[in-house]
């Protein structure tokens, strides 16, 4: 029986050109975690985290996407395309999957918002599919 | 230039073991990767059979787990596999290959000649 | 385990065809999906990986697209050299699986 709990960093704001980090953490339950998937609103990955095998960061954000801190993600350079829906997909063992949402807005530079993560935001917590 | 060569008996009875060891040359395995064990029946596709990490930790195929250990001989450079209880659907070539998942995601990017093992009385 | 799926299981084509071959995944797997050709008598070789990028030294022929459930693999210009069968393969989840294969023939 799936019994976690994923807390999020819930709905956040950061400034264009700016950064974010993007965290989530499971909870109530003692199921490994074999990996996490990082994936954008559009469905693309944007990284994996594999316990034993490390990081994979995709092609395509390798030079603005940074690991961690933890198992989170670290979005740099935003623009305004980054506004949007992010996923972070646990799979574990023996529970199965979990997930949990995110969404970013990314302000523009003149606008209110913060940067590093350190914007609005509003924890969420989610239950398994 | 990364090089990987499998070796081990080419028959193999039904009931016993299967054992097979993968040289690594142009590189330490410990220093980096996980090294990986894939095998392919006659004229069909390919099955992951499990990993061993540079740090000694190891995943097996859920399919095979009961069966399967991988392990490294890092004073020789070389990680080996083994597989018990063999029957005849164990016969394959057996492929090793290394997966270098920081740049290449779950693709294998370095592959072995493979070499066939064949389990008969 | 994520199941994939290829087809044509076999196909033929002449010397500078177009050739696409098409592998569906069992569930979304995103674009944690790569593409290896295999000569006859020979291991697998890396051509794409993450979906649609080439790994190094791949010709530029060779080329991958898709997300989700969905993948293609193309040859735009068939080349005799490239008689062989392909193989899709995921990494979303954490046991990798492969597709059953393409066997590709010159007409």
């Known amino acids: 029986m799936m019994t976690g709990t994923i807390e999020t960093t819930g709905n956040i704001s950061a400034k264009k050109g700016g950064s974010v980090i993007l965290q989530c953490h499971l909870s109530s339950t003692m199921a490994q975690v074999t990996q996490v998937n990082w994936e954008q609103h559009d469905h693309s990955l944007l990284a994996i985290r594999n316990a034993e095998l490390g990081w994979h960061i995709y092609p395509a954000f390798k030079d603005r996407v940074a690991p961690g801190p933890g198992l989170g993600l670290t979005l740099q350079s935003l623009t305004m395309n980054d506004t949007g829906e992010y996923f972070c997909t646990y799979h574990t063992y023996p529970d199965g999957t979990y997930r949990g949402r995110i969404f970013l807005e990314v302000l523009e530079s003149s606008g209110g918002g913060g940067a590093g993560g350190g914007g609005h935001h509003h924890h969420h917590h989610h239950h398994h599919h | 230039q990364v090089q990987l060569q499998e070796s081990g008996p080419g028959l193999v009875k039904p009931s016993e073991t299967l054992s097979l060891t993968c040289a690594v040359y142009?590189?330490?395995?410990?220093?980096?990767?996980?090294w990986h064990w894939i095998r392919q029946p006659p004229g069909k596709g390919l099955e992951w059979i499990g990993y061993?990490?540079?740090?000694?930790?190891?995943n097996y195929n859920p399919s095979l787990k009961s069966r399967v250990t991988i392990s490294v001989d890092t004073s020789k450079n070389q990680f080996s596999l083994k597989l018990s209880s063999v029957t005849a659907a164990d016969t394959a070539v057996y492929y090793c290959?290394?997966?270098?998942?920081?740049?290449?995601?779950?693709?294998?990017?370095?592959w072995g000649q493979g070499t066939l093992v064949t389990v008969s009385s | 385990d994520i199941q994939m799926t290829q087809s044509p299981s076999s196909l033929s084509a002449s010397v500078g065809d177009r050739v696409t071959i098409t592998c569906k995944a069992s569930?979304?797997?995103?674009?944690?999906v790569a593409w290896y050709q295999q000569k006859p008598g020979k291991a697998p070789k890396l051509l794409i990986y993450?979906?649609?990028y080439r790994y190094t030294g791949v010709p530029s022929r060779f080329s991958g697209s898709g997300s989700g459930t969905d993948f293609t693999f193309t040859i735009s210009s068939l080349q005799p050299e490239d008689i062989a069968t392909y193989y899709c393969?995921?990494?979303?989840?954490?046991?990798?699986?492969f597709g059953g294969g393409t066997k590709l023939e010159i007409k």
């Open positions: 393969q995921q990494y979303y989840s954490t046991q990798w699986t």
């Open positions: 569930q979304d797997v995103r674009t944690a």
């Open positions: 290959a290394r997966m270098d998942y920081g740049n290449y995601g779950g693709a294998m990017d370095y």
């Open positions: 993450s979906a649609s």
């Open positions: 061993v990490h540079y740090s000694g930790s190891t």
């Open positions: 142009g590189y330490s395995i410990t220093s980096g990767y996980s």
